[in-house]
């Protein structure tokens, strides 16, 4: 077999950070100050740091608070994302379908029919993987039909998310290798939904969404 799999390189999420974090993202300081009486008009023109007057008070943007938005918050509450995704770029070769120029056109009926059959086949292949979300065909090319596609995986955020996704990607590799080895043409006849070229399976790239709280904090600031 010449199935090729790349090594995945990802940056580990920092396990500790000085940024205050809680899942409900409740502000720790009030961001508005109400004003009553004649002096309010003067206050209106004095809102600082991008604050806007709403008729009663200065509405302060993120990072600022106080009557005139003159105070800077000392901490920002940020929480991790709810889910983390991984995208695997795979290539498989389908031998049970003859390539036509129409398959290059994603709007054509031929492409749509191929996409439906291929998607159904992959949903069966990966059905036992809880993290499996679906497949997205990016390109079809001659050979008979070389299918470049993405397999999307998703897991809830935990400190162990990388291990969960690493395990899921390994199972994807095992399952696609198995099906493309077993479902092959015999005497030019395919007795399965789709048949494959045993040697045409490749994993080009695996991208795992990185969660970096410090980067999130920089963006907010």
């Amino acid at each position: 077999r010449t199935t090729s799999f790349p090594t995945v390189t990802t940056t580990a999420v920092p396990t500790n950070t000085t940024i205050k974090s809680n899942p409900t993202s409740t502000p720790t300081v009030p961001r508005t100050t109400t004003c009553f009486g004649d002096g309010c008009q003067n206050t209106a023109s004095r809102c600082k740091n991008g604050g806007t007057w709403d008729g009663l008070k200065c509405q302060c943007p993120n990072l600022y608070y106080g009557e005139l938005c003159e105070e800077v918050v000392s901490s920002i509450d940020i929480g991790p994302p709810e889910t983390i995704s991984a995208q695997m770029e795979l290539t498989v070769t389908v031998t049970s379908v003859k390539f036509t120029e129409e398959l290059k056109n994603h709007s054509s009926q031929e492409f749509q029919e191929f996409k439906q059959t291929f998607t159904e086949q992959m949903n069966i292949v990966y059905s036992g993987i809880p993290e499996y979300v679906g497949v997205n065909i990016t390109k079809l090319r001659l050979g008979s039909v070389v299918v470049e596609h993405d397999v999307l995986l998703r897991t809830k955020y935990t400190p162990e998310y990388k291990t969960v996704l690493d395990n899921a990607t390994e199972v994807v590799k095992e399952k696609i290798t198995k099906v493309t080895t077993q479902q092959i043409m015999i005497n030019d006849i395919c007795s399965d939904m789709m048949c494959f070229n045993t040697t045409g399976t490749q994993v080009q790239n695996i991208t795992v969404t990185q969660y970096d709280p410090e980067e999130d904090c920089r963006k907010m600031a």
Partner: antibody, heavy 121, light 111 residues
Framework: QVQLVQSGAEVKKPGASVKVSCKAS????????IHWVRQAPGQGLEWMGR????????KYGPRFQGRVTITADTSTSTVYMELSSLRSEDTAVYYC??????????????WGQGTLVTVSS | DIVLTQSPASLAVSPGQRATITCRAS??????????MHWYQQKPGQPPKLLIY???SLESGVPARFSGSGSGTDFTLTINPVEADDTANYYC?????????FGQGTKVEIK
């Protein structure tokens, strides 16, 4: 083996609150989501919300928003569902259920036995 | 919210025959070609039991008499052949979008 064991039946007066517990065993609740679903007598199933016990994230159905609170105690592998401002139409069997796998969206593969909550004056 | 409409509301089938329940969603429950539609069986006094997940995947331990099909907005649960023990309510459920929603249920009786 995977099990979800819920607290016993409750009878409450209108306006009161009820807190139902769901104790998990056979798996780590931090590794998945726990959902709550209710079923009024003779009626269908209604999703109330879910919690990610690893970080406390919750998502509630719009019909229950503001009245339901789902919490988790990972030290005891127990998830709680509290429903406040009870009315007679809240009389139902309340189920907790485990999400299939670590990702979502997904199905619910294991269910608690159900807790009957009766709201009556 | 995605509304799921099941039909028929009830059906009576003889043992050995085929039972077909359909579930139509008010909008697609598909992500990347994968349909997040699931089927449950519920017998009186019991919690629901997962039969089929993601439209067509058979849950572990569920007899192969049960099968699911469909994509996008139209889904089918088939029991073939039906057995006496299959008397129950059957529900479809989508998890493609919050809030998760269930169909109103289909009551299957064995003649």
């Amino acid at each position: 083996q995977v099990q979800l064991v819920q607290s016993g039946a409750e009878v409450k007066k209108p306006g009161a609150s009820v807190k139902v517990s769901c104790k998990a065993s056979g798996f780590n609740i931090k590794d998945t989501y726990i959902h709550w679903v209710r079923q009024a007598p003779g009626q269908g199933l209604e999703w109330m919300g879910r919690i990610d016990p690893a970080n406390g994230y919750t998502k509630y159905g719009p019909r229950f928003q503001g009245r339901v609170t789902i919490t988790a105690d990972t030290s005891t592998s127990t998830v709680y569902m509290e429903l406040s401002s009870l009315r007679s139409e809240d009389t139902a069997v309340y189920y907790c259920a485990r999400n299939y796998g670590t990702s979502y969206p997904n199905a619910m593969d294991y269910w608690g036995q159900g807790t009957l909550v009766t709201v009556s004056s | 919210d995605i509304v799921l409409t099941q039909s028929p509301a009830s059906l009576a089938v003889s043992p050995g025959q085929r039972a077909t329940i359909t579930c139509r969603a008010s909008e697609s429950v598909e992500t990347y070609g994968n349909s997040f539609m699931h089927w449950y069986q519920q017998k009186p006094g019991q919690p629901p039991k997962l039969l089929i997940y993601r439209a067509s995947s058979l849950e572990s331990g569920v007899p192969a008499r049960f099968s699911g099909s469909g994509s996008g907005t139209d889904f089918t649960l088939t029991i073939n052949p039906v057995e006496a023990d299959d008397t129950a309510n059957y529900y479809c459920q989508q998890s493609n979008e919050d809030p998760y929603t269930f169909g109103q249920g289909t009551k299957v009786e064995i003649k």
